[in-house]
């Protein structure tokens, strides 16, 4: 006996009460694949969730988080509080990054500033709570006598005017 249900397309369900006729999914439900014997209830985006995509007969609703929160988990199953740049989220809420660390996003943890000296470079721009340090040329590149495209200007003693 051929299973007539396999002919039922997405957006319908196989109604056993009606001789395996394909019936459309009732309001607020969907079936994303063919051959379904039931339709799934649409997800409701409420509370801290807002609707990113409405539910249709063939696909579930997609939720996003309201302003001040960001999605966590598969399919935005949770909303986590945003912090400001320069902060990280702890058990006691948003806390400023400790000295020597930064966070340039509204989520995630504070990360240590780049250690320029590990790459043999010097600090060009100091780090802040919101920004990493910017590494520049190595100290050796900046010392007098180092080869460069333009020769360094002659050194003068402070307080002496050029001859």
């Amino acid at each position: 006996l051929q299973d007539l249900c396999s002919n039922c397309p997405a957006g319908t369900f196989c109604d056993n009460n009606r001789s395996q006729i394909c019936s459309p999914c009732p309001p607020n439900s969907f079936s994303s694949a063919g051959g379904q014997r039931t339709c799934d209830i649409c997800r409701q985006c409420k509370g801290v969730f807002k609707t990113r995509k409405e539910c249709s007969s063939t696909s579930n609703a997609e939720c996003d988080c309201i302003s001040g929160y960001h999605c966590l988990g598969a399919e935005c199953s949770m909303c986590e509080q945003d912090c400001k740049q320069g902060q990280e989220l702890t058990k006691k809420g948003c806390k400023d990054c400790c000295f020597g660390t930064f966070n340039d996003q509204k989520r995630g943890i504070c990360r240590p500033w780049t250690n320029c000296s590990l790459d043999g470079k010097s600090v060009l721009v100091n780090g802040t709570k919101e920004r990493d340090v910017v590494c520049g040329p190595s100290p050796a590149d900046l010392s007098p006598g180092a080869s460069s495209a333009t020769p360094p200007a002659p050194a003068r003693e402070p307080g002496h005017s050029p001859q």
Epitope: K46, C63, S77, M78, E80, Q81, K91, G93
Partner: nanobody, 121 residues
Framework: QVQLVESGGGLVQAGGALRLSCAAS????????IGWFRQAPGKEREGVLC????????IYADSVKGRFTISRDNAKNTVYLQMNSLKPEDTAVYYC??????????????WGQGTQVTVSS
């Protein structure tokens, strides 16, 4: 069954004060955080304040700093939102919600039905 019920809303003049209550039934608030959210007409819902199970307070909305405070009375299974120096822009439906922790909300969290606060100028 599990329920959160808000009360204490009403009409108040700008500069006035209100104290909202969020009473829990069907479960104990001892191990739950309680957050207050609000939704003004035509606007997205926004977080206001939250108090953790240990009493730590998180302020979500900078605009309420120094004006709104949150407290809990575990013996009465109730959390309070004290709103002072009210402004017309505080007009909204205020909801309480019981997440596990103040920083993270899921679709399983219990929400109240809301209480209307209207601030007239």
């Amino acid at each position: 069954q599990v329920q959160l019920v808000e009360s204490g809303g009403g009409l108040v003049q700008a500069g006035g004060a209100l104290r909202l209550s969020c009473a829990a039934s069907g479960f104990t608030l001892d191990y739950s955080a309680i957050g207050w959210f609000r939704q003004a007409p035509g606007k997205e819902r926004e977080g206001v304040l939250c108090i953790s199970s240990s009493g730590d307070v998180t302020i979500y909305a900078d605009s309420v700093k120094g004006r709104f405070t949150i407290s809990r009375d575990n013996a009465k299974n109730t959390v309070y939102l004290q709103m002072n120096s009210l402004k017309p822009e505080d007009t909204a439906v205020y909801y309480c919600v019981a997440p596990r922790i103040c920083s993270t909300y899921s679709s399983d969290d219990y929400w109240g039905q809301g209480t209307q606060v209207t601030v007239s100028s």
